[in-house]
């Protein structure tokens, strides 16, 4: 029984509001209750918006003043419950809900996948490590249940020991050359321009697990660089295609202080990682333009810019190189923070749903932390297939190899 109607004086609603037009105040007199009057008035004053049964796919309708609300069943959404949620579950929408990689399929639901060293959980979206040291995780933080590093670099902070475990220090003839990024146990990514002036290729050393350059704490691992692979399109002394892939003579041993950064799939990097605003850059580079280099590894959080915005916000310099589709800008134009000489080749690492990925390589800029200029980074997503193909290839004789690109 409808208690709401039973309480009305017989005939009053019929007489006052059905046979004649009544006002809100007259209805208020009948109902004696503001809430009940409001419920009646919504339908009475502008008709029942639910009368046409607008809610589809089994949704229930609630009339409102000049409108209605649909309450949808779990699998549907949209104003009229017209959209099947699985139809919206596509990779361009929030990475399809996937923790790592997402693939669209025609006619069927998208599927999630995980990077090597991870496996997909039963929920179909989450990834769990299957190895002790999966890429993109920071063991010392995972073990103490912390999340992001505190957070070279001009205007940055010291990267606490072990919180940048993929950082590589490159030495030539015993002197600091550049940074690099470990992407698996035998491969390091760096910048091509680091090798422009190398004469003694046999004296290239990569050091992993390094933190303080003035101290040997036992966590470091040094390896000879067996091969330096540079794209055939890179021209020494220029800025485009500034990437190098280094093969180590022996694999490193993964530890709490030596862990690779994940090399992402191209589509994931382009449609998801590229839209993560802040990323970390790190290195032992100069602390000021023309200043001393850092002894402790430094890290800096930098915002990424669309190239158009970067060009609009940068001061025009006559001899400034173009920012091509193989680069991107990141950082600050106020002169406060930037990567610098000595950081070159180091990682621009992006965090997404619990895992870190390589998205850029410290490449070039107009000075360091120069007012009106941003840092420019190699856009790693353009080289994923090139890198993967080379990592599957057999070693070739000679240290320097120029490999066709694309």
């Amino acid at each position: 029984a409808n208690a709401f109607l039973e309480e009305l004086r017989p005939g009053s609603l019929e007489r006052e509001c059905k046979e004649e037009q009544c006002s809100f105040e007259e209805a208020r007199e009948i109902f004696k209750d503001a809430e009940r009057t409001k419920l009646f008035w919504i339908s009475y004053s502008d008709g029942d918006q639910c009368a046409s049964s607008p809610c589809q796919n089994g949704g229930s309708c609630k009339d409102q003043l000049q409108s209605y609300i649909c309450f949808c069943l779990p699998a549907f959404e949209g104003r009229n419950c017209e959209t099947h949620k699985d139809d919206q579950l596509i990779c361009v929408n929030e990475n399809g809900g996937c923790e790592q990689y997402c693939s669209d399929h025609t006619g069927t639901k998208r599927s999630c996948r995980c990077h090597e060293g991870y496996s997909l959980l039963a929920d179909g979206v989450s990834c769990t490590p299957t190895v002790e040291y999966p890429c993109g995780k920071i063991p010392i933080l995972e073990k103490r249940n912390a999340s992001k590093p505190q957070g070279r670099i001009v205007g940055g902070k010291v990267c606490p020991k072990g919180e940048c475990p993929w950082q590589v220090l490159l030495l030539v003839n015993g002197a600091q050359l550049c940074g690099g990024t470990l992407i698996n146990t035998i491969w390091v990514v760096s910048a091509a321009h680091c090798f422009d002036k190398i004469k003694n290729w046999r004296n290239l050393i990569a050091v992993l697990g390094e933190h303080d350059l003035s101290e040997h704490d036992g966590d470091e691992q040094s390896r000879r660089v067996a091969q330096v692979i540079i794209p055939s399109t890179y021209v020494p002394g220029t800025t485009n295609h500034d990437i190098a892939l280094l093969r180590l003579h022996q694999p490193v041993v993964l530890t709490d202080h030596v862990v690779p950064l994940c090399l992402p799939e191209r589509t994931f990097s382009e449609r998801t990682l590229a839209f993560v605003r802040f990323s970390l850059v790190s290195g032992w580079g100069q602390l000021l333009d023309r200043g001393a280099t850092a002894l402790e590894l430094m890290v800096l959080n930098v915002p990424r810019l669309m190239t158009q915005d970067c060009l609009q916000q940068s001061r025009k310099v006559g001899d400034s190189p173009n920012i091509t589709e193989y680069m991107f800008c990141a950082g600050y134009s106020d002169g406060s923070k930037d990567s610098c000489k000595g950081d070159s080749g180091g990682p621009h690492a992006t965090h997404y749903r619990g895992t870190w990925y390589l998205t850029g390589i410290v490449s070039w800029g107009q000075g360091c932390a120069t007012v009106g200029h941003f840092g420019v980074y190699t856009r790693v997503s353009q080289y994923i297939e090139w890198l993967q193909k080379l990592m599957r290839s057999e070693p070739r004789p000679g240290v320097l190899l120029r490999a066709p690109f694309p």
Epitope: L169, L171, G174, A175, Q176, R202, N203, I205, V207, E210, D212, L213, S214, E215, H216, D217, G218, S222, R223, R224, H249, Q250, L295
Partner: antibody
């Protein structure tokens, strides 16, 4: 230029302790590590331990707890203290500066001779 | 501890000759190996580090090579002033360890 100079007692009685000072110039102890190495007469080199710029020390476990290394950055001095000396501790004791990145000892002192005898 | 073995205690050579002094590690230490020269009555001097990088001021007749566990110091065109003891050292792991040394004699 870089210089290191060791100064020690020369003669130490058995079971007594040894103290040697390494005074450095041409570099800062806050930036570079200093190792201690010894060489018994007519024999090879034995690494004893190191103190790094930040103050961390690493000792050769073969010497157990007999060895301690410390420093005074403001005086540019590094100290080696060794307890319970025996005849086989007789040696030339060297201090040596470490370079960056390489962990190698790129500059050495002339050494100070220590004889353990009663 | 890592043991560094220099199998030749003494090596004899003529002025102008080429000599190779070898060093074997008990485990992989590549490339964290250094070579030192100690002339009679003097302190050791660094010659080579990272297995093959010459220290500042070291003549280019001194060359370091090798990998893994086997390392070599080669002196080409030996000079009389090269008469000395030569020690290899690993700095891959603590404690740092030295080889027993090779005495180079000039005939």
């Amino acid at each position: 230029q870089v210089q290191l100079k060791e100064s020690g007692p020369g003669l130490v009685a058995p079971s007594q302790s040894l103290s040697i000072t390494c005074t450095v110039s041409g570099f800062s102890l806050t930036d570079y590590g200093v190792s201690w190495i010894r060489q018994p007469p007519g024999k090879g080199l034995e690494w004893l331990g190191v103190i790094w710029g930040g103050g961390n020390t690493y000792n050769n476990s073969a010497l157990k707890s007999r060895l301690s290394i410390s420093k005074d950055n403001s005086k540019s001095q590094v100290f080696l203290k060794m307890n319970s000396l025996q005849a086989d501790d007789t040696a030339m004791y060297f201090c040596a500066k470490h370079g960056y990145y390489g962990y190698v000892m790129d500059y050495w002192g002339q050494g100070t001779s220590v004889t353990v005898s009663s | 501890d890592i043991v560094m073995t220099q199998s030749h205690k003494i090596m004899s050579t003529l002025v102008g000759d080429r000599v190779s002094i070898t060093c074997k590690a008990s485990q992989d230490v590549d490339p964290a190996v250094a070579w030192y020269q100690q002339k009679p009555g003097q302190y050791p001097k660094l010659l080579i580090y990272w297995a093959s990088t010459r220290h500042t001021g070291v003549p280019d007749r001194f060359t370091g090579s090798g990998s893994g566990t086997d390392f070599t110091l080669t002196i080409s065109n030996v000079q009389s002033e090269d008469l000395a003891d030569y020690f290899c050292q690993q700095y891959s792991k603590y404690p740092y360890t030295f080889g027993g040394g090779t005495k180079l004699e000039i005939k």
